[in-house]
């Protein structure tokens, strides 16, 4: 029997190589029962996570999960960095895994590195 | 219910490649990760590496990097491993490995594939 | 590498008697988020392998109560607390934390 209880399914460890100057969405997959939960997203900052505030986001329902979206439009240089979604949920504090957008500045876009080079750098895949 | 349906046996060449499919159903195959695992004839396990089919990233142990290559087609909810430049020691079972929403868990395993390199 | 080093190699266990695996990492498997990514894996002869264990001690669904997983840090144990001819195989420990994931050697089980 699945549980009621609200989970945040942003995959562990994932990645996301991303261009400035492109628009993106970040997305953090809901699953709930019956209240859609008051979802917020923040961005790591060493070991405290800052709520983001001012930012546009939005949601996506699909069949069996709801996505609450963390707009980038543009991608700027400095949103390099980790993100997490977390949801209230019965007086809980619910928190996804972190995912990690690493950021590409367009002026060095025709050096930029393709997915399997980001993978084999010895400093994104080991911590 | 989650269900990793592997490609057949293959009977490969030193020097030559092969390329592996795993079609998923059951679950929402972006929203996982797709691992592959291999086993050489009466020995252990090792991970060959991961993709992420929402985005094509992907991670590989170092001693595969290069050689192997990960790719994924959310259309037909399909992974593939690409192994190119075979020897003999790549003669192996390899199985494709999905997880629960991106737990990197390892949950469900396919029936596995039997590589064979030899000249 | 975090190196996975298992023991025994082997074991050959009576029926009904108790049988235990250790597994030591070569690095404290607690991540950042307060987890511990170590699994155990069974695979019986001529299968694929299957999840057995979870985060070092939660038992998956459809898993005999007979085996647990205890453990923290660099150390874990796999214990099956009665042994039955269908345990025979090769048993697995694995460690998610950092990349590239690592498997144990393995340690085969057999039934006198």
């Known amino acids: 029997k699945e549980s009621c209880d609200v989970q945040l399914y942003i995959k562990r460890q994932s990645e996301h190589s991303i261009l400035a100057g492109d628009p993106f969405e970040l997305e953090c997959p809901v699953k709930y029962c019956a209240n859609r939960p008051h979802v917020t997203w923040c961005k790591l900052n060493g070991t405290t996570c800052v709520k983001l505030e001012d930012r546009q986001t939005s949601w996506k329902e699909e069949k069996n999960i709801s996505f609450f979206i963390l707009h980038f439009e543009p991608v700027l240089p400095n949103d390099n960095g980790s993100y997490r979604c977390s949801a209230n949920f019965q007086s809980n504090l619910i928190e996804s895994h972190s995912t990690t957008l690493y950021v590409t500045d367009v002026k060095s876009a025709s050096e930029r590195p393709s997915k399997d080079e980001m993978a084999s750098r010895p400093w994104l895949l080991y911590r | 219910q989650v269900q990793l349906v592997q490609s057949g046996a293959e009977v490969k060449k030193p020097g030559a490649s092969v390329k592996l499919s795993c079609k998923a159903s059951g679950y929402n195959f972006k929203h996982t990760y797709a691992h592959w695992v291999r086993q050489a004839p009466g020995q252990g396990l090792e991970w060959i590496g991961r993709?992420?089919?929402?985005?094509?990233?992907?991670k590989y142990d170092p001693k595969f990097q290069g050689r192997a290559t990960m790719t994924a087609d959310t259309a037909s909810n399909t992974a593939y491993l690409e192994l190119s430049s075979l020897r003999s020691e790549d003669t192996a079972v390899y199985y494709c490995v999905a997880d629960h929403y991106g737990s990197s868990l390892l949950d469900y395993w396919g029936q596995g594939t039997l590589v064979t390199v030899s000249s | 590498d975090i190196v996975m080093t298992q023991t025994p190699l082997s074991l050959s266990v009576t029926p009904g008697q108790p049988a235990s695996i250790s597994c030591k990492s070569s690095q404290s498997l607690l991540d950042s988020d307060g987890k511990t990514y170590l699994n155990w894996f069974q695979q019986r002869p001529g299968q694929s392998p299957r999840r057995l264990m979870h985060l070092v001690s939660k038992l998956d669904s459809g898993v005999p109560d007979r085996f647990s997983g205890s453990g923290s840090g660099t150390d874990f144990t796999l214990k099956i607390s009665r042994v039955e001819a269908e345990d025979v195989g090769v048993y697995y420990c694995?460690?998610?934390?950092?990349?590239?994931?690592?498997f144990g050697q393995g340690t085969k089980l057999e039934i006198k």
């Open positions: 993709i992420d089919p929402a985005n094509g990233n992907t």
């Open positions: 694995w460690q998610g934390t950092y990349f590239p994931y690592t």
